[in-house]
């Protein structure tokens, strides 16, 4: 029988603490045993649970991808917090990867928001002040601007 084949309670490390569920639930940092009788602690740095639960195993800790920095490590009650490296951002609609921020705004637009780990630079039309959304323009259309210098 391989380690993988064994049920969770047979794989539990000797040092994993056990306690009794409260109204069928185990506290954050724990999961419930298959028979529902015990709460078993998550393994620090490997898995976690954030809420009272009746999960049969804790949740696997996220590993930060290349291109990401680890803001805070995984604990038994909180997942790893990863953030895009400087100059890149993660959009809500494509959370699986960090994308490069645009280096500047299209002609006729001015930068009003910087690149952050969660948003691209923000561009608005000079005259109307309306936001520009969409893909980065072709390189020859791009006008770069440094802070304090309006785009020409």
């Amino acid at each position: 029988i391989t380690q993988q084949d064994l049920a969770p309670q047979q794989r539990a490390a000797p040092q994993q603490k056990r306690s009794s569920p409260s109204e069928g639930l185990c506290p954050p940092g724990h999961h419930i045993s298959e028979d529902g009788r015990d709460c078993i602690s998550c393994k620090y740095g490997q898995d976690y649970s954030t809420h009272w639960n009746d999960l049969l195993f804790c949740l696997r800790c996220t590993r930060c991808d290349s291109g990401e920095v680890e803001l805070s490590p995984c604990t038994t009650t909180r997942n790893t917090v990863c953030q895009c490296e400087e100059g890149t951002f993660r959009e809500e609609d494509s959370p699986e990867m960090c994308r490069k921020c645009r280096t500047g705004c299209p002609r006729g637009m001015v930068k009003v928001g910087d690149c952050t780990p969660w948003s691209d630079i923000e561009c608005v039309h000079k005259e109307s002040g309306t936001k520009h959304s969409g893909e980065a323009p072709a390189v020859e259309e791009t006008v770069t601007s440094s802070p304090g210098t309006p785009a020409s």
Epitope: L6, Q10, I32, D35, L55, L56, F57, L59
Partner: antibody, heavy 117, light 110 residues
Framework: QSVEESGGRLVTPGTPLTLTCTVS????????MSWVRQAPGKGLEWIGI?????TTYYASWAKGRFTISKTSTTVDLKVTSPTTEDTATYFC??????????????WGPGTLVTVSS | ALVMTQTPSSVSAAVGGTVTINCQAS??????LAWFQQKPGQPPKLLIY???KLASGVPSRFSGSGSGTEFTLTISDLECDDAATYYC????????????FGGGTEVVVK
């Protein structure tokens, strides 16, 4: 390693029926086992599971209608009071634990139960 | 009770093509989703467990993705042998949550 269901037959409504899943090549003390059924021409329907320690859990719709139990080499599914809607092929499946997930990786060929008056 | 909604119910594609099947859970099931292939007269065969991990012997043309409540099975470089019905299932992960199956998707290979 294998699992095989038996006990499927034609029964009249209300007549209790027990299906047996016989396993070989592995120990039931190390694996959870599920029962799943499939009505003719229909999809798969999960009935319940018995854990490696013998604790049973049932689908919401199946509670009271089925009872799962086990010995060292068999897992039984008792259909307490069959109706015509229980006509189906019944499968048992071994649940493998992958560290952060279970999955039914080893299935029997199924046994057909027909409930008719 | 947990409900798994699978779409489409049937899909047709040519040999060499790509098929995408969606599965939606009525509540958060984290990454506890499995995909099965079933051919007439046979028991289901496990393809993918824990959302995206390939079961032993399953070709890499099969891939799974998603988390929480939205999941996808993709079959690329479709072969004639892929003609079957595919089911998603919320795998056992909680003592109070049903291991419900989706309604199935019939894949027809042209």
């Amino acid at each position: 390693q294998s699992v095989e269901e038996s006990g499927g037959r034609l029964v009249t409504p209300g007549t209790p029926l027990t299906l047996t899943c016989t396993v070989s090549g592995f120990s039931l003390s190390n694996y959870a086992m599920s029962w799943v059924r499939q009505a003719p021409g229909k999809g798969l329907e999960w009935i319940g599971i018995i854990s490696s320690s013998g604790t049973t859990y049932y689908a919401s719709w199946a509670k009271g209608r089925f009872t799962i139990s086990k010995t060292s080499t068999t897992v039984d599914l008792k259909v307490t009071s069959p109706t015509t809607e229980d006509t189906a092929t019944y499968f048992c499946a071994r649940e493998t634990y992958y560290g952060y997930s279970y999955a039914a990786g080893l299935w029997g060929p199924g046994t057909l139960v027909t409930v008719s008056s | 009770a947990l409900v798994m909604t699978q779409t489409p119910s049937s899909v047709s594609a040519a040999v060499g093509g790509t098929v995408t099947i969606n599965c939606q859970a009525s509540q958060n099931i984290y990454s506890n989703l499995a995909w099965f292939q079933q051919k007439p007269g046979q028991p289901p065969k496990l393809l993918i467990y824990e959302t995206s991990k390939l079961a032993s012997g399953v070709p890499s043309r099969f891939s799974g993705s998603g988390s929480g409540t939205e999941f996808t099975l993709t079959i690329s470089d479709l072969e004639c042998d892929d003609a079957a019905t595919y089911y998603c299932q919320s795998s056992w992960h909680s003592i109070s949550t049903d291991c419900a199956f989706g309604g199935g998707t019939e894949v027809v290979v042209k």
